[in-house]
């Protein structure tokens, strides 16, 4: 119910979170769960817990396996796991695909390429960035804030892209790279004032208390490469990442189609385990780009399990 | 929807001992821990302790861990708060509650409707 | 165990004033709950997590403070903000309450 998979390379720093959420005051405690042994918490190890988080610096083959957190609220534990896998850095320029993390689209008007998991480390700008292996240069390439801008993009843009970054630990610097794909959608077209497809306006869903449950924001901007378009949720007018219910994600990226010729974006909302609260929350499927924004609300219901007689 | 719903009050003798019920509905009654919380005129509110329904587990005030005991059905999604060893100290409105977000610690957001225990001879 | 203390322990207000009530903690808290409670009902959350609004609460009221000194504002007082509020730390066990204020309407 609570574990997460991470995975990094020897010699990297990695960072993982914990799984399972608690006020930033709560105590938590790292345990490696084969031995039961406890993750120290002082900064000179070189695997060490420090809250929330769990920080290989650098990480190694051996560190490999589930790791237990324990959130210490007032009243009771609450326990999570995070799965690590360490892997050997590879000889050549092929990044396998385990070490990929979710494959973005971008077009000839909107090619940002997001670093993975950046958000977890202390680094500083400017990023850099690999195709295949090779050190992007020229003009058409900006490395701006956590993500890679490529100007007048075309299909041949396609491929693997790597960000390197330096996280740095009490003066100590540390290499971390994540690779994920890019894809490019190529085609001449127009934009117009953004058409939610999914869900319709004001559309009650029904769901299961106690099961999983998906909502796909869809909207459509018009026809071929659009430029500045987005979709994105919110719950109560509050934005995914900062409500602060870790049951309640949005899908990483956004997925991009193409519907009878127009460009199209989709934005999965998933509820984990939902729970009665859930029902007396607003979700909101917002669509915008340059034209404007356009918003469909959506509530959920509660739907019965049928009862199966035998 | 959430409901906590409470049994009846109570007219107990001194010395005795009454349980009093909490059945939940509209959630996953494993999923949360449920607290119960003692209110009278001269001591306000006091938190008693607190269950967690999956495991059994419990945490008590101090105060009245010779007072009480939490236990919890899951069968019937039903939690209970025996009170033991009544004196007149002991009358009072005896609440169910939980918390909105279980691992948020986020107040009490679901209280019943309360149960009134008369302690008197 | 954490000691809350409330004050004032009564108060009165005229519609439209602007009404301030404290809740001192004996040690640091991380976070202040505040509770409503009217005669013959149960407390209703009101206030979480120091200034978050609880559904249906009226946006005229509003909660700050940190370590050990809290409060709960009303910015314009209407004749149904008349109850007793009780604030409330879930820093550490025991969870622990105010005594509570009670607020009149003048």
């Known amino acids: 119910k609570f574990s997460k998979q991470s995975w990094g390379l020897e010699n990297e720093a990695l960072i993982v979170r914990c799984p399972r959420q608690g006020k930033p005051s709560y105590t938590v405690d790292w345990y490696y769960s084969q031995t039961n042994k406890s993750i120290p918490t002082q900064e000179r190890n070189r695997v060490f817990a420090s809250g929330q988080l769990l920080k290989f610096l650098p990480a190694a083959v051996a560190d490999s396996g589930i790791y237990t957190c324990i959130v210490r609220s007032p009243t009771f534990n609450r326990t999570g796991y995070a799965n690590v896998t360490i892997y050997k850095k590879q000889s050549d320029c092929n990044v396998p695909d385990y070490l990929m993390y979710s494959t973005v689209s971008g077009s000839e008007k909107n090619s940002k390429i997001y670093c993975p998991t950046i958000d977890l480390y202390n680094w500083t700008a400017p990023l850099e960035w690999f195709k295949n292996c090779q050190a992007l240069q020229g003009s058409r390439y900006r490395a701006h804030k956590s993500f890679l801008v490529i100007d007048n993009v075309m299909t041949e843009d396609a491929g693997d892209y790597t960000c390197k970054f330096i996280h740095n630990e009490n003066g100590a610097n540390y290499s971390v790279t994540a690779t994920r794909s890019f894809t490019v959608k190529d085609e001449q077209g127009f934009s117009l004032f953004p058409v939610i497809g999914a869900p319709a306006q004001n559309e009650i869903k029904e769901v299961e208390i106690g099961k999983n449950a998906n909502l796909t924001c869809s909207a459509c901007f018009g026809k071929g490469t659009q430029f500045l378009a987005a979709v994105l949720w919110q719950l109560n007018g509050t934005k995914i990442t900062d409500f602060g219910e870790p049951r309640i994600q949005q899908e990483e990226g956004q997925n991009q189609s193409f519907s009878n010729g127009l460009a199209c974006l989709d934005m999965v909302l998933r509820i984990a385990d939902v729970k009665e609260e859930d029902l007396l929350l607003q979700y909101d499927c917002l669509a915008l780009n340059l034209h404007g924004l356009r918003r469909h609300t959506v509530r959920l219901s509660r739907k019965n399990p049928i009862d199966h007689h035998s | 929807q959430v409901q906590l719903q409470q049994s009846g009050a109570e007219l107990v003798r001194p010395g005795a001992s009454v349980t009093l019920s909490c059945k939940a509905s509209?959630?996953?009654?494993?999923?949360?821990?449920l607290h119960w919380v003692k209110q009278t005129p001269v001591h306000g509110l006091e938190w008693i302790g607190t269950?967690?329904?999956?495991?059994?587990?419990?945490v008590y005030n101090q105060k009245f861990k010779a007072k009480a005991i939490l236990t919890a059905d899951k069968s019937s999604s039903t939690a209970y708060m025996e009170f033991r060893s009544l004196t007149s100290e002991d009358s009072a409105v005896c609440y169910c509650?939980?918390?909105?977000?279980?691992?948020?610690?986020?107040?009490?957001?679901?209280w019943g409707q309360g149960t009134l225990v008369t302690v008197s001879a | 165990q954490i000691v809350m203390t409330q004050t004032p322990a009564i108060m009165s207000a005229s519609p439209g004033e602007k009404v301030t009530m404290t809740c001192s903690v004996s040690?640091?808290?991380?976070?202040m709950h505040w509770y409503q409670q009217k005669s013959g009902t149960s407390p209703k959350r009101w206030i979480y997590?120091?200034?978050k609004l609880a559904s249906g609460v009226p946006a005229r009221f509003s909660g700050s403070g940190s370590g050990t000194s809290y409060s709960l504002t009303i910015n314009n007082m209407e004749a149904e903000d008349a109850a007793t509020y009780y604030c409330?730390?879930?820093?550490?066990?025991?969870?622990?309450f105010g005594a509570g204020t009670k607020l009149e309407l003048k």
């Open positions: 509650t939980r918390a909105f977000y279980n691992d948020y610690d986020d107040g009490f957001a679901y």
């Open positions: 997590d120091t200034s």
């Open positions: 269950i967690d329904p999956e495991t059994g587990d419990t």
């Open positions: 409330q730390q879930w820093n550490s066990s025991p969870l622990t």
């Open positions: 040690s640091s808290v991380s976070y």
């Open positions: 509209g959630y996953t009654f494993t999923d949360y821990e």
